[in-house]
């Protein structure tokens, strides 16, 4: 799913207020819902009919530093016999997400939002038509 | 996938630098990769063997204001005949993502990161065990 463009109005003060100095805003420390419970994945990536692997990218100047990307293991989907069914296709499910980029020069530290496209997992689909023409 | 806890070290200045005043940081206006290309969705939510619907939540004090959540349509998966196969299960694929929360009191506007759990889509899995003993 796609994140709509900001149009930057979200980050602006109301028109009746003085503008934000230096093109930056105040970001409070701490994260709301940081401790929210996430249910365990239960290895769905291995038990799916469109299984996937994970790779982790690491960047110390990004929050979260660790971004996990899924890659579908097969082109086709896995049938009940454990064989690849080529009439069905394993396709990635992608999601735009926000991360925070840290920029520093000496003791001057600033942050900026960044959009990242993450492949979250894979699903098995029937192509609209079976053959190219 | 779960976003690791910050431990707040990410948002702190190096130890040798004076601390951030008032528990806030500088967030630059603008979003990196805002115009990145996202491939079309191609209705995979309808053509998946574990199809899903979308619902949109809207909050003007959140960026993005629109957060889309998927709900699996069925408990089982859809077979080649278009019937629900109850030996397989449609399960949600979830992803923790960041949003920005806007807080204002008059002309004083600040922002804070917030974790949101998003269901991005569904995938078809083989249950670990078929029957409860």
């Amino acid at each position: 799913r796609k994140i709509p463009k900001v149009g930057h109005t979200f980050f602006q003060k109301p028109e009746s207020c003085p503008p934000v100095p230096g093109g930056s805003m105040k970001l409070d420390i701490g994260i709301i819902n940081e401790n929210q419970r996430v249910s365990m994945s239960r290895n769905i990536e291995s038990r799916s009919t469109s299984p996937w692997n994970y790779t982790v990218t690491w960047d110390p100047n990004r929050y979260p530093s660790e971004v996990v990307q899924a890659q579908c293991r097969n082109l086709g989907c896995i049938n009940a016999q454990g064989k690849e069914d080529i009439s069905m296709n394993s396709v990635p499910i992608q999601q735009e997400t926000l991360v925070v980029r840290r920029k520093h020069q000496g003791c001057s530290v600033s942050f900026q939002l960044e959009k990242v496209l993450v492949t979250v997992g894979c699903t098995c689909v029937t192509p609209v038509i079976h053959h190219v023409q | 996938r779960k976003i690791p806890k910050v431990g707040h070290t990410f948002f702190q200045k190096p130890e040798s630098c004076p601390p951030v005043p008032g528990g806030s940081m500088k967030l630059d206006i603008g979003i990196i990769n805002e115009n990145q290309r996202v491939s079309m969705s191609r209705n995979i939510e309808s053509r998946s063997t574990s199809p899903w619907n979308y619902t949109v939540t809207w909050d003007p004090n959140r960026y993005p204001s629109e957060v889309v959540q998927a709900q699996c349509r069925n408990l089982g998966c859809i077979n080649a005949q278009g019937k629900e196969d109850i030996s397989m299960n449609s399960v949600p694929i979830q992803q923790e993502t960041l949003v920005v929360r806007r807080k204002h009191q008059g002309c004083s506007v600040s922002f804070q990161l917030e974790k949101v759990l998003v269901t991005v889509g569904c995938t078809c899995v083989t249950p670990v065990i078929h029957h409860v003993q």
């Epitope: 097969n74 069914d85 394993s90 396709v91 492949t119 053959h131 190219v132 | 491939s39």
Partner: antibody, heavy 123, light 106 residues
Framework: QVQLVQSGAEVKKPGASVKVSCKAS????????MHWVKQAPGQRLEWMGG????????SYNQNFKGKATLTVDTSASTAYMELSSLRSEDTAVYYC????????????????WGQGTTVTVSS | DIQMTQSPSSLSASVGDRVTITCSAS?????MHWYQQKPGKVPKLLIY???KLASGVPSRFSGSGSGTDFTLTISSLQPEDVATYYC?????????FGQGTKLEIK
Amino acid sequence: QVQLVQSGAEVKKPGASVKVSCKASGYTFNEYTMHWVKQAPGQRLEWMGGINPNSGGVSYNQNFKGKATLTVDTSASTAYMELSSLRSEDTAVYYCARGGDGYYTNYFDIDYWGQGTTVTVSS
Amino acid sequence: DIQMTQSPSSLSASVGDRVTITCSASSSVNYMHWYQQKPGKVPKLLIYDTSKLASGVPSRFSGSGSGTDFTLTISSLQPEDVATYYCQQWNSHPLTFGQGTKLEIK
């Protein structure tokens, strides 16, 4: 128009490896699968496997698992097929061929072919 | 793997003749493709989904069949039809091809 341009002929010694490239143009490389097909002299065509540059998904013919490795460089719109531990029976013409996009057309539907790369294994 | 057997392996016919090539699968398949490969050239899709003509292919070519037995027919052979013809099953992994039928002009 869609074009698949393969690297030139190779002569290799037994036991060596070879990497054949296939440069795609005229379409969005990430959106379609790429397959590889072997044609040994006087033999039938053999499907080796296919790769999806977008998802990373790969499917191999069991006969080529451990022999062929399929990779892509999306930034260069190029697919690669590497053959290891070459033997005389690997002497063949190798074709890359574009498959479907998985959404509108099946991944396993082949429409466009490269011109072929001859790999000769000889001591 | 599904084995594909074509017959004949080679044939010679005169211009204007009706030519039939058959392909037998070791187990039932839903779809069959036919490819034409002219000497020194790349294979070209001729028939897909058993009976559908690929774009730009002359109407003298046709395909038929179901289950395990499939046929490629050229209603009136032309000199430019000299080639090797391959059937390919599109049903189960892996994709497999017939051994080819080499067609020559008498």
